[in-house]
């Protein structure tokens, strides 16, 4: 139930995928990750106006109730709809190992 | 990777399940739903401080980057981790029908 993709707030203001460059130090990983040294972190950022990329019925309800009770019910939030995997070379008790993380990089976004 | 359940902001301030009473009119459903007339909508509301109920690695990254770049990267957001189904009696072209919605009521919450 992915609703409208037209952003009424203007281009790039609504929930979408952004890329943020981060070092291992930024992420607090320097002591356990060897590679990559820098990560292009894809994440979901932006506003979720009425019915914009509503993930499901719950998001639609949230929009309606936020309109009625903005101090009680927050607007839907821009979060990952799916993820891309990422492989890290990480330190282990015995040395180093390749490890795949399935929930690290956002692939696309919706409002919930 | 569900992290700490202790809220550093004080009892009830962090991401958790809330119940909001809503009529069919509130939800904009009055023209297509016959029953129930009122819904106890369970939804996820509250702050997501560092590592509180972090859903996954992405949420942990988001926390780290929000701390570094608060104007660019938002804090993780309180959203449903799972849902309870709900049955509606709804109007159809031929009369009425029972319909189960699996993504309507939040069952529990996490930060992402």
């Amino acid at each position: 139930a992915r609703n409208g993709d037209h952003c009424p707030l203007g281009p790039g203001r609504c929930c979408r995928l952004h890329t943020v460059r981060a070092s291992l130090e930024d992420l607090g990983w320097a002591d356990w990750v060897l590679s990559p040294r820098e990560v292009q972190v894809t994440m979901c950022i932006g506003a979720c106006p009425s019915q914009f990329r509503a993930a499901n019925m719950h998001a639609q309800i949230k929009t309606s109730l936020h309109r009625l009770k903005p101090d009680t019910v927050p607007a839907p939030c821009c979060v990952p709809a799916s993820y891309n995997p990422m492989v890290l070379i990480q330190k282990t008790d015995t040395g180093v190992s390749l490890q795949t993380y399935d929930d690290l990089l956002a692939k696309d976004c919706h409002c919930i | 990777a569900r992290n700490g359940d202790h809220c550093p902001l004080g009892p009830g301030r962090c991401c958790r399940l809330h119940t909001v009473r809503a009529s069919l009119e509130d939800l904009g459903w009055a023209d297509w739903v016959l029953s129930p007339r009122e819904v106890q909508v369970t939804m996820c509301i509250g702050a997501c401080p560092s590592q509180f109920r972090a859903a996954n690695m992405h949420a942990q990254i988001k926390t780290s980057l929000h701390r570094l770049k608060p104007d660019t990267v938002p804090a993780p957001c309180c959203v449903p981790a799972s849902y309870n189904p709900m049955v509606l009696i709804q109007k159809t072209d031929t009369g009425v029908s029972l319909q189960t919605y699996d993504d309507l009521l939040a069952k529990d919450c996490h930060c992402i």
Epitope: L34, S35, P36, R37, N84, P85, M86, V87, L88, I89, T92, D93, T94, G95, V96, S97, L98, Q99, T100, L105 | -
Partner: antibody, heavy 121, light 110 residues
Framework: EVQLLESGGGLVQPGGSLRLSCAVS????????MTWVRQAPGKGLEWIGI???????YYASWAKGRFTISKDSSKNTVYLQMNSLRAEDTAVYFC???????????????WGQGTLVTVSS | DIVMTQSPATLSVSPGERATLSCQAS??????LAWFQQKPGQPPRLLIY???TLASGIPARFSGSGSGTEFTLTISSLQSEDFAVYYC????????????FGQGTKVEIK
């Protein structure tokens, strides 16, 4: 003593399949990644892929689909299943401990002696 | 796909001289690089890992440098036992992981 021993090589017809084994001793496969490498006669080394300590597999693009790496930690053995074999797959196949570009603790250079696979009709 | 390119293909050096071998990666592989020595009929022998760390038991005349896409193996003073084929290996990780060896550099007696 830490050892790696490949077996299962031999003569196979084009289009055939073969499963190579790498029996390890002196360490646990649940703690170490394992790499397969091959070398055609008179040619250079070729990276085939890795199976991680947790069981994830990673392959060279040319190996995806035809080659499968697996392991049985209870038998302390890593396998390389090779399907749809071609003449150009003729090579000595080596297994090695670790991901090779970084060293594990202890012995830094653990390779088997290799097993020869010949693909010919 | 990651591609590792070694140069030169053959290096003719006199014993006691310095040898410099190059390896270039098609992707930024940080320090995910190792150097191996191989002699006929033997498995490869690890010399350098993490681009610049000397493996245990390897003489100090071997050294590695570089990061990102450009790497160098230096043998400061060639001994008779150093005449062999040398390979670099790079591993690239991001959405997946893939490794590749360079085509090798043969170091021969001049």
């Amino acid at each position: 003593e830490v050892q790696l021993l490949e077996s299962g090589g031999g003569l196979v017809q084009p289009g055939g399949s073969l499963r190579l084994s790498c029996a390890v001793s002196g360490f646990s496969l649940s703690s170490y990644d394992m790499t397969w490498v091959r070398q055609a006669p008179g040619k250079g080394l070729e990276w085939i892929g890795i199976i991680s300590s947790s069981g994830n597999t990673y392959y060279a693009s040319w190996a995806k689909g035809r080659f499968t790496i697996s392991k049985d930690s209870s038998k302390n053995t890593v396998y390389l299943q090779m399907n749809s074999l071609r003449a150009e797959d003729t090579a000595v196949y080596f297994c090695a401990r670790g991901i090779l570009v970084y060293a594990d603790y202890g012995d830094h250079n653990l390779w088997g002696q290799g097993t020869l696979v010949t693909v010919s009709s | 796909d990651i591609v590792m390119t070694q140069s030169p293909a053959t290096l003719s050096v006199s014993p006691g001289e310095r040898a410099t071998l190059s390896c270039q990666a098609s992707e930024d592989i940080y320090t995910n690089l190792a150097w191996f020595q191989q002699k006929p009929g033997q498995p490869p022998r690890l010399l350098i890992y993490a681009a610049s760390t000397l493996a245990s038991g390897i003489p100090a005349r071997f050294s590695g440098s570089g990061s990102g896409t450009e790497f160098t193996l230096t043998i400061s003073s060639l001994q008779s036992e150093d005449f062999a084929v040398y390979y670099c290996l790079g591993v690239y990780t991001y959405i997946s992981a893939e490794g590749a060896f360079g085509q090798g550099t043969k170091v021969e007696i001049k």
